[in-house]
């Protein structure tokens, strides 16, 4: 668990490796846990700098420690979980709140336990990396403060909110221990897909994780994005973005929780004392010091949240699972306790759900989630969250159905129409996703104001023919979720050059085009045979980007790994690549053959980073019919010549030949990243 | 490196006391709840008492209270184990031991000291 | 008090074969305090498992934990020479800590 600084991870999640294999994958949206940067310009601040952190309730480890704008980051990314998970979020409060009622019976906590989540490694993540990625995919965000709980609960102390037009840093999170699935935005795809672990690669793991949890020396780096921090827990975006409308503004407002039943109310100088050195970022002196109140007062509820949250806290310090992992287990036992307030069993198992998610124990959330609207079932925000624990595991259509009911309920909840939304696009329901999408967004609700919405509902009215996807791209770039109106790479390391085209020269990798070009009949006789022999290896486009025809790639490497198998049958041109460490090394990318059949037509999309640049060599390249469009200039190819282009750039393929059209596609990594950043970014 | 160094041990009579202490150093004293564990020869582990990291709380197995001090020093790093009214059943291997920061485990332990009471 | 009760009491078993040592306790046990420690005669114990299940520095991965409310086990994959020893388990609860009596392992 070790974090990364959050500025770094922020936006990175992709340290994530939840396997160790190092993708980036799934949406790294696990990985990415809700890191939502704000903009892929700005600066990202020193890790260092995102320590320090006032917010007590953010104070959570990884997320929480973070400076304000770290906090901020995070808690937007914890917000856009978080709000994806519709956290209430409510004022700080003190201690002193009233007796909250006592939560509903509670079912037994066993069915918790039961999570199926194995591997709880939280991969150490470093902070060597600055590069501030702005992720957007839909994972669970990570979250800053101790989740919207705490923010909700702040309740102890009054706390600042974490300035949230400040950059986010690139932070450095915890890793989950991606046992599970995550939503995300892969390239255009609009599916929450399992998490593939996006990361970092972990080093010296030894056993699986059940056995043994990576250790909090191991390390692991993940790239960051910056943005200002958009949403803040308590806050929804676009009150952040300071709106007048008062009921924005009631939207945002809560009451207080009350956190502490009878008991706690005639301990709670011990517990404002203990609270107060947590809140002072003192979390080693507040662990012992709600320790010792736990060992005193066994059935104190508030004592035994203030321990899991310090713990939390903890963990996010040290950057550990194993910390992490006690503090989801001290959350729990604060829900089996008796005469817990139901403000104070809400904020527990809500952030309890938050962590497991952060650790990718996304079956293990969904179980609390779904314990907490049996307690809760009035709770909308509660069903909302339910939803995207659906979604994160890949049950869409559960989610689906979560959604329904909540619209059924609250017909304008936009965090439900931006998911439903989502839900429709990835059935490949366009015309029916574009009014949840596009009023889910206009609503404002806190978890709607998130890049992949607005790529969804563009690539959505884009497929339609309705003009105004552009609109929603420049909405979008406004709010910091894309570089530009045309650059719309979710997972992206800010300050690199951002062109559509390029040359060989501007690259710096004038060799390898070199090699390309003098081999192309090799590289395309080693292809053709392939096609001919062992027509199988060449698998169909399965990311839903075509509107008709057949397009099929035969993959040599990806995510920075040769593909043995594949290589059998290309054998000289893999040793050919082998001497381009630019292309084999990229994570990011692949090395492919590229096999258009006539009649098809690939729609408008954007790859899911700016950390690659695409070379196309042309091996078979029918007369006419065949061109490709990036941003606004289109090209077409040429046999033994390569043509490279930013794929983060919105780009289109026509294929209206008469015969197939043949390219080899090769990625490298975008020559500005410097070799710190290539050996750690999380693969995609 | 994380050190508990016991203080000798000794034979006593029935009835009478003894004060054992147990020097730490390797880490921030301060910052531990600190334990005894006790082991009669032959016999496994018992828990005889825990102190909080700031001597404010303290807590005993049901057969020492009443009898048995936990006591801490923190300027010195020292921490104490005050034995009144000795029984011939205490006689025991003593262990001085560090509770871990963030759990209710023993991570650390001293080398122990032998306390026989017998007259 | 909360009891744990170890078994076996002993366990005889050759070097290279699985052990498998249980700890059950009177009442449910939060999983975050339960700890497993290896004693060597002559030595003071030592930390080999917290948490029911997280292997403590320096122990090597042939050593696991599980379980969860009152059964606990220890698991040794492949027992080497130098694990033949007494094992505990310990929990905390309440202000009161409690050890198990001890599974002793020895050479078959």
């Known amino acids: 668990f070790d974090l990364v600084d959050y500025e770094e991870v922020l936006g990175k999640l992709g340290i994530y490796d939840a396997d160790g294999d190092g993708d980036f994958d799934v949406d790294d949206a696990k990985v990415l846990l809700g890191l939502k940067e704000r903009s892929t310009s700005e600066p990202a601040v020193p890790p260092e700098e995102a320590e320090p952190h006032t917010e007590p309730e953010e104070q959570v480890p990884v997320e929480a420690e973070p400076q304000n704008i770290e906090d901020e980051a995070k808690e937007q990314i914890q917000s856009l979980l978080h709000e994806m998970v519709h956290a209430e979020h409510v004022e700080g409060e003190d201690l002193q709140q009233e007796d909250g009622p006592t939560g509903e019976p509670q079912q037994e906590d066993d069915e918790f336990l039961m999570a199926t989540d194995v591997d709880d490694r939280f991969e150490t993540l470093e902070p060597e990396v600055s590069h501030e990625e702005t992720e957007h995919s839909y994972h669970v965000e990570e979250t800053v403060s101790q989740d919207c709980n705490q923010d909700m609960e702040e309740m102890m102390s009054e706390q600042e909110n974490p300035d949230s037009s400040e950059p986010v840093v690139e932070d450095e999170r915890l890793h989950h221990d991606t046992d599970d699935v995550t939503y995300q935005v892969y390239e255009e795809q609009a599916v929450y897909e399992p998490l593939e672990n996006e990361g970092i690669e972990i080093t010296e793991v030894t056993a699986p994780p059940e056995d043994n949890p990576v250790e909090d020396s191991q390390v692991i780096v993940e790239e960051v994005s910056i943005f200002p921090v958009e949403e803040q827990q308590e806050v929804p975006p676009e009150t952040n973005r300071k709106t007048d409308d008062p009921e924005q503004k009631a939207k945002v407002k809560k009451k207080k929780p009350k956190l502490l039943n009878k008991f706690d109310k005639t301990i709670k100088a011990e517990l404002d004392a203990a609270e107060k050195l947590r809140k002072r970022g003192k979390i080693e002196e507040a662990v012992n010091a709600f320790k010792e109140l736990v060992r005193k007062y066994p059935q104190s509820p508030r004592a035994r949240y203030g321990k899991a949250q310090c713990e939390d806290d903890l963990a996010e310090k040290r950057r550990s699972n194993e910390v992490l992992r006690g503090a989801i287990e001290t959350y729990q036992e604060v829900a089996s306790l008796p005469d817990v307030p139901a403000d104070l069993l809400k904020l527990s198992l809500k952030r309890r759900s938050d962590r497991q998610q952060f650790l990718g124990h996304m079956r293990g959330s969904l179980l609390t989630l779904q314990r907490l609207v049996q307690l809760f079932p009035n709770d909308t925000s509660l069903k909302n969250d339910l939803g995207v624990g659906y979604l994160l595991i890949g049950d869409n259509d559960n989610a689906k159905k979560v959604y329904e009911e909540v619209l059924s309920v609250t017909p304008n909840d936009g965090f439900a129409k931006v998911h439903y939304g989502f839900i429709l696009k990835a059935q490949n329901k366009i015309a029916e996703s574009i009014p949840y999408l596009k009023e889910g967004i206009e609503s404002g609700d806190p978890g709607t104001d998130d890049g992949r919405f607005y790529f969804h509902l563009g690539d959505a009215m884009q497929r339609v023919g309705n003009k105004e996807a552009y609109k929603w791209y420049e909405l979008g770039h406004k709010r910091g979720h894309f570089a530009s109106v045309w650059q719309r790479s979710l997972y992206n390391v800010n300050g690199l050059k951002a062109q559509p085209w390029w040359t060989p020269k501007e690259t710096g990798y004038t060799e390898l085009v070199k090699s390309l070009e003098r081999n192309w009949k090799l590289i395309r006789d080693e292809g053709l045979a392939v096609m001919d022999k062992a027509k199988g290896l060449f698998l169909p486009e399965d990311e839903n980007l075509r509107e008709k025809g057949d397009w099929s790639q035969f993959t040599l490497w990806q995510q920075g790994r040769r593909n043995e198998n594949a290589c059998k049958g290309a054998p000289k041109t893999c040793t050919l690549l082998e001497k381009f460490p630019e292309t084999t090394g990229c994570r990011r990318g692949q090395i492919k053959y590229s096999i258009m059949h006539p009649g098809t037509h690939v729609w408008p999309h954007t790859g899911p980073t700016n950390c690659r640049l695409r070379m196309h060599l042309g091996l078979v390249i029918p007369k006419e019919g065949c061109k490709i469009r990036c941003a606004n200039e289109t090209k077409t190819w040429e046999e033994g010549k390569v043509l490279i282009f930013d794929d983060s750039f919105e780009h289109e393929v026509w294929q209206d030949a008469s015969s197939f059209r043949l390219i080899f596609i090769v990625d490298v990594w975008h020559p500005e990243l410097t070799p710190q950043q290539r050996r750690s970014l999380p693969a995609i | 490196q994380v050190q508990l160094v016991q203080s000798e041990g000794g034979v006593v009579q029935p009835g009478r006391s003894l004060r054992l202490s147990c020097a730490a150093s390797?880490?921030?004293?301060?910052?531990?709840?600190m334990h005894w564990v006790r082991q009669a020869p032959g016999k496994g582990l018992e828990w005889v008492a825990v102190?909080?990291?700031?001597?404010?709380?303290?807590y005993y197995t049901d057969s020492v209270k009443g009898r048995f001090t936990i006591s801490r020093d923190n300027s010195k790093n020292t921490l104490y184990l005050q034995m009144d009214s000795l029984r011939p059943e205490d006689t025991a291997l003593y262990y001085c031991?560090?509770?871990?920061?963030?759990?209710?485990?023993?991570?650390?332990w001293g080398q122990g000291t032998l306390v026989t009471v017998s007259s | 008090e909360i009891v744990l009760t170890q078994s076996p009491g002993t366990l005889s078993l050759s070097p290279g074969e699985r052990a498998t040592l249980s700890c059950r306790a009177s009442?449910?046990?939060?999983?975050?305090?339960l700890a497993w420690y290896q004693q060597k005669p002559g030595q003071a114990p030592r930390l080999l498992i917290y948490?029911?299940?997280s292997r403590a520095t320096g122990i090597p991965d042939r050593f696991s934990g599980s379980g969860s409310g009152t059964d606990f086990t220890l698991t040794i994959s492949r027992l080497e020479p130098e694990d033949f020893a007494v094992y505990y388990c310990?929990?905390?609860?309440?202000?009161?800590?409690?050890f198990g009596q001890g599974t002793r392992l020895e050479v078959k």
């Open positions: 031991a560090r509770e871990a920061s963030s759990g209710w485990y023993i991570d650390s």
């Open positions: 390797g880490f921030t004293f301060n910052d531990y709840a």
């Open positions: 102190i909080s990291y700031d001597g404010s709380n303290k």
């Open positions: 009442q449910s046990v939060s999983s975050s305090y």
């Open positions: 948490g029911a299940s």
């Open positions: 310990q929990q905390y609860g309440s202000s009161q800590v409690t």
